[in-house]
């Protein structure tokens, strides 16, 4: 079970964009191409934007999330990809408090991104009220913002 | 697009046992509930409990407990449900629904056009 | 369990007309600052269809006409303009405790 106090709230997201630093045995299932990277991660995008833009909209006051603790960009020379697995129990657990069919459509994608083998960690909601609210805000805002410093390395490197 | 597919009509006798599948098509199966419900002749539905595929665990309705048995076949994507100990108060339509992704339950926003089971001596 | 009590249990009504139908919750089905509250339509021979999930979120594919509202334990479906189509028994039902319970149906 992760804890969503402090720095641990994003531990999961710190291999959103990693798959390069990982050991082979978590190497996806089927490896995507660059060009199927972007497609996904153009779909993505606006999904991602709607969903922030929404909930940013609907929850006047939340403090902006601390973007630091994402590292996106691996300093290997190879591409990075995101890791489906890492963000999808995120959007499963946040699904039942935002708009389910863009949640639906997010975890779709995101699925085309998993790793093999590699176990889901389960996210429970914050059960205070504010946290709850930042941690969704946080996961959204993190989440775009992985998106665009991905799709920036796809589209700066070799086509 | 997202579909659910039941098998067919059964007719079975009073203390037998009915296996009826539910095979998911259109979205990705693992992270997804799948409920079965019942609704009686001229009835309200009524849940009978749910399975989650990607751990196979399952959450059933006391009412059924002891007779019902969920599991899934993530190979195949399809969800069997197995009653036992079948009474005539059991003919109903027996019907499959995709519910929600987490521990949170959600609306059940897919169905599977059911199945008819019919207990009769 | 929750025990929902959806009012009134069959109505008459003509196409244009504004239609309310209630569902009361014995015990209240918020949960997270959300209301799990969701209600189906079921026409004769075919499955129920997601109408409204959480009690007010109209879902995909569904016409306007259809809107939902409430809180706590009290809740209304109402279709604004209604169309020959709309006839169906409708049903409320809430997600927020097992067992999932569902209302008699209007």
């Known amino acids: 079970m992760l804890s969503h106090a402090g720095p641990a709230r994003f531990a999961l997201f710190l291999l959103c964009c990693m798959e390069t630093l990982l050991p082979s045995h978590m190497a996806p299932t089927h490896r995507l191409q660059p060009s199927d990277v972007r497609k996904i991660i153009l779909e993505l995008r606006p999904m991602s934007k709607g969903l922030l833009q929404d909930y940013v909209s609907k929850e006047i006051g939340l403090p902006e999330s601390n973007h630091s603790s994402l590292p996106c960009l691996s300093s290997d020379s190879q591409l990075p990809h995101i890791n489906g697995s890492a963000i999808l129990p995120y959007f499963r657990a946040i699904r039942p408090l935002s708009d389910k069919n863009t949640i639906d459509k997010i975890i779709e994608q995101l699925d085309k991104l998993k790793f093999q083998r590699e176990p889901e960690a389960e996210v429970s909601m914050p059960a205070d009220n504010f946290e709850r609210k930042n941690f969704i805000l946080a996961v959204l805002q993190q989440f775009s913002a992985c998106l665009e410093h991905v799709l920036q390395s796809l589209n700066s490197g070799p086509q | 697009q997202v579909l659910l597919v039941q098998s067919g009509a059964e007719v079975k006798k009073p203390g037998a046992s009915v296996k009826i599948f539910c095979k998911a098509s259109g979205y990705s199966f693992t992270y997804y509930d799948i409920n079965w419900l019942r609704q009686a002749p001229e009835q309200g539905l009524e849940w009978m409990g749910w399975i989650f595929p990607g751990d196979g665990g399952t959450k059933y309705n006391e009412t059924f407990k002891g007779r019902l048995t969920l599991t899934a076949d993530t190979s195949t994507n399809t969800v069997y449900m197995e009653l036992s100990s079948l009474r005539s108060a059991d003919t109903a339509m027996y019907y499959c629904?995709?519910?929600?992704?987490?521990?949170?339950?959600?609306?059940?926003?897919?169905w599977g056009q059911g199945a008819l089971v019919t207990v009769s001596s | 369990e929750i025990q929902m009590t959806q009012s009134p249990s069959s109505l008459s009504a003509s196409p244009g007309d504004r239609v309310t139908i209630t569902c009361r919750a014995s015990e209240s089905v918020d949960n997270y600052g959300i209301s799990f509250m969701h209600w189906y339509q079921q026409k004769p021979g075919q499955p129920p269809k997601l109408l409204i999930y959480r009690a007010s979120n109209l879902e995909s594919g569904v016409p306007s006409r259809f809107s939902g509202s409430g809180s706590g334990t009290d809740f209304t479906l109402t279709i604004s303009s209604l169309e020959p189509e709309d006839a169906a028994t409708y049903y409320c039902q809430q997600s927020n405790k097992d067992p999932l319970t569902f209302g008699q149906g209007t």
């Open positions: 629904a995709r519910g929600g992704t987490s521990v949170i339950r959600d609306a059940m926003d897919y």
